[in-house]
């Protein structure tokens, strides 16, 4: 499966569209997950509505939003207020029971705004950063938020 590389500017939104065969994936929920390693687990960020007929409704987790057009066969993920910590390799998945079929691999590259005076050596993930489904999120004393990635796939 080829990897699609998408670039986004820090502070802006990035929209990802994953297309699929609407007939083949009829009745299946979709998910967006972050791959923690080359052969490691893919930690779910957000998934579409539990009721498939309502998959068109936007579902949000932190700054990540997902919606599925099941007739057109397009699931759209929006990463809002993109931050350096959002960079990574993600998967669009089609869920069937406990199985997850990879629809697309997406490498998200976050570019710093060259006009921004912020210290580019300090890549804090800010308070608005998205958390992960089922993940514990602890606030530290600095202005970042440490997001946990449990080792579940």
């Amino acid at each position: 499966l080829n990897t699609t590389v998408l670039q986004g500017m820090a502070g802006q939104s990035l929209r990802v569209s994953c297309t699929y065969d609407a007939l083949k994936h009829w009745g299946r929920r979709k998910a967006w997950c972050r791959q923690l390693g080359e052969e490691g687990p893919c930690q779910r960020v957000v998934s579409t509505h539990g009721v498939w007929l309502l998959a068109f409704l936007k579902k949000r987790n932190g700054s990540t939003v997902i919606a599925d057009d099941t007739l057109a066969g397009t699931v759209t993920i929006t990463l809002k207020n993109l931050q350096a910590g959002d960079a990574g390799l993600y998967q669009c998945q089609s869920l069937r029971g406990r199985e997850a079929e990879v629809l697309q691999k997406v490498l998200v590259e976050v570019l710093e705004d060259p006009l921004d005076d912020q210290d580019a050596g300090d890549l804090w993930v800010p308070e608005e950063s998205s958390s992960f489904e089922g993940a514990q999120v602890e606030h530290s004393t600095s202005r970042n938020q440490e997001t946990s990635f449990p080792p579940t796939s």
Partner: antibody
């Protein structure tokens, strides 16, 4: 098999420049963040700088900011570290590393190249 | 910057022993931690990422645990080839900082 081969190290006087290169093979270079990590003699590891997969953004540790420049040539699968205004405290073995998708951990390392800054 | 402190500085064990080394972060880092092994004269090698995920080819005698500020690397039944320096590293949020290392020697 992932391979990272560094070159360009050597002995240099304080205030002078040196350019390190890292030739990568065994993976799609343009799909990966890359970084340099250094290790002073008999000391621990120290992250130096990282670069996004396209080279669009670079990040440096405070002590090298303004002196070191990280760049890449995706067509040649090569990473570069231009080191200017070198100081004695920059003396170290410099490792070229592949950084996993912006996560800040380094899954593959080169053999390292020694940089000695001394008069 | 978050400081990573490793303990003990060094330890000497026999083949077959179970060893646990520690890494303490000065602030909460969630489970954003990696461990590396560096044998004498060699480059570091990734062992574990996000606290407990073993990297490709790493034997299952290496296990990681902890959360927040306190982390452990455990080697069940130490082998002669495990003699090395072990470094922890705070990941996910830069600047990426390493601990000072723990030296594991075999008797």
């Amino acid at each position: 098999e992932v391979q990272l081969v560094e070159s360009g190290g050597g002995l240099v006087q304080p205030g002078r420049s040196l350019k390190l290169s890292c030739a990568a093979s065994g993976f799609t270079f343009s799909n990966y963040y890359m970084a340099w990590v250094r290790q002073a003699p008999t000391k621990g590891l120290e992250w130096v700088a990282s670069l996004t997969n396209s080279g669009g953004s670079t990040y440096y540790r405070d002590s090298v900011k303004g002196r070191f420049t990280l760049s890449r040539d995706n067509a040649k699968s090569t990473l570069y570290l231009q080191m200017d205004s070198l100081r004695s405290e920059d003396t170290a073995t410099y490792y070229c590393t592949r950084e996993w998708a912006g996560s800040g951990y380094f899954d593959y390392w080169g053999q390292g190249v020694m940089v000695t800054v001394s008069s | 910057n978050i400081v990573m402190t490793q303990s003990p500085k060094s330890m000497s064990l026999s083949v077959g022993d179970r060893v646990t080394m520690n890494c303490k972060a000065s602030q909460n880092v969630g489970n954003n931690l990696a461990w590396y092994q560096q044998k004498p004269g060699q480059s570091p090698k990734l062992l574990l990422y996000y606290t407990s995920n073993r990297f490709t080819g790493v034997p299952d005698r290496f296990t990681g645990g902890g959360y927040g500020t306190d982390f452990t690397l455990t080697i069940n039944s130490v082998q002669a080839e495990d003699a090395a320096f072990y470094y922890c590293q705070r990941i996910y949020n830069s600047p990426w900082t390493f601990g000072g290392g723990t030296k594991l020697e075999l008797k």
